[in-house]
Amino acid sequence: LIIGFGISGKHFITVTTFTSAGNIGEDGTLSCTFEPDIKLNGIVIQWLKEGIKGLVHEFKEGKDDLSQQHEMFRGRTAVFADQVVVGNASLRLKNVQLTDAGTYTCYIRTSKGKGNANLEYKTGAFSMPEINVDYNASSESLRCEAPRWFPQPTVAWASQVDQGANFSEVSNTSFELNSENVTMKVVSVLYNVTINNTYSCMIENDIAKATGDIKVTDSEVKRRSQLQLLNSG
């Protein structure tokens, strides 16, 4: 969370941003809020990126003006125009690229004053893992797959019964480059699993951490997955 202040005459306006992460190839949001101003035509929103000449996006007089926009953002940006009057200056970013990572500035000017705040935007790839019982293996195994990760993550297994056990000797992890030659498919196999136990497959890089749990009993298989973005907020 970053809060910036600005001065216009005697007026401060508070601008607040949140560090966030973008999933490459997907759509992202760069969050920014400011003190609302009912005079829409008097609001100017400018998004800038460190090291880039030209703007990422500009919204003024109630509409977009991309005449100063840098080419790398062409056709990929929009503000939530109907939410500007209530103080939302967040930026939609289409088709997030690895090169979109960096420091952005959200600059606001209203009839109350002006202000700005920076945010760090991280980019990578992250996806939910899915764990299945691998019945084809000679001994009962678990197969954990996640379709898109970047940078290359670490993969670790854990078990509810054998807490603290190191499964690296009885697991095998591979990374397969996807067709766009950036992201990778993660596949990890855990061998010699026992029933009536809950196993967890944990995939983590510097952007996200994902966990897939599977409980195997004689009568059923229960699965659960979760994904958490790191260092955001």
Partner: antibody, heavy 121, light 107 residues
Framework: QVQLQESGPGLVKPSQTLSLTCTVS??????????WSWIRQHPGKGLEWIGN???????YYNPSLKSRVTISVDTSKNQFSLKLSSVTAADTAVYYC?????????????WGRGTLVTVSS | DIQMTQSPSSVSASVGDRVTITCRAS??????LAWYQQKPGKAPKLLIY???SLQSGVPSRFSGSGSGTDFTLTISSLQPEDFATYYC?????????FGGGTKVEIK
């Protein structure tokens, strides 16, 4: 409401330059919320996006045509134009001008009627 | 470039039929997909944008679904004026590309 109308010669000789203009009526090309595109359709075939322009003059072209295409804008006349150089019979098509529905959506919500351009000697 | 593959290339149907057209992208395009209707001698008309949003003025019998690589256009009850060619278009990545079209013909 906003309307688009293509104009230009219907017949162009091989190796020459195809020139078309799209006139926007009922709204200003400078309003800032849109990109303006050219799209073509070969006889009996599918659609091919040629490129687009913003009112400020910044352009983006389809890489397959980039070396031959120029799109320009004249805000005083509320027009944007297409030039395609070194044409061959393969450039015979119906050429449409269109408006992208927003600066991010990149779908085409308004189209001109289209104009058939034949490349023949 | 992202390739857009439509199927079938043509379909014969009767008034009142439910018609489904599919479009597959060669790579993920999130929900950045539009559908158009084109009648002979006319310009295409936008029906659906953002995969499932109905363009203003388009009848509710048209609907779109899908995300990622697989998308569907459905006409719930075919009307006489719906006999036309339908195109999908990806709006995710330059250059924007269209599918080859699906012709809906009278059975």
């Amino acid at each position: 409401q906003v309307q688009l109308q293509e104009s230009g010669p219907g017949l162009v000789k091989p190796s020459q330059t195809l020139s078309l203009t799209c006139t926007v009526s009922g709204g200003s090309i400078s309003s800032g919320g849109y990109y303006w595109s050219w799209i073509r359709q070969h006889p009996g075939k599918g659609l091919e996006w040629i490129g687009n322009i913003y009112y400020s003059g910044s352009t983006y072209y389809n890489p397959s045509l980039k070396s031959r295409v120029t799109i320009s804008v004249d805000t005083s006349k509320n027009q944007f134009s297409l030039k395609l150089s070194s044409v061959t019979a393969a450039d015979t098509a119906v050429y449409y001008c269109a408006r992208e529905s927003s600066t991010i959506s990149a779908d085409f919500d308004l189209w001109g009627r289209g104009t058939l351009v034949t490349v023949s000697s | 470039d992202i390739q857009m593959t439509q199927s079938p290339s043509s379909v014969s149907a009767s008034v009142g039929d439910r018609v489904t057209i599919t479009c597959r992208a060669s790579q993920g395009i999130s929900r950045w997909l539009a559908w158009y209707q084109q009648k002979p001698g006319k310009a295409p008309k936008l029906l659906i944008y953002a995969a499932s949003s109905l363009q203003s003025g388009v009848p509710s019998r048209f609907s779109g679904s899908g995300s990622g690589t697989d998308f569907t256009l459905t006409i719930s009850s075919l009307q006489p004026e719906d006999f036309a060619t339908y195109y999908c278009q990806q709006a995710h990545t330059f250059p924007y590309t269209f599918g080859g079209g699906t012709k809906v013909e009278i059975k």
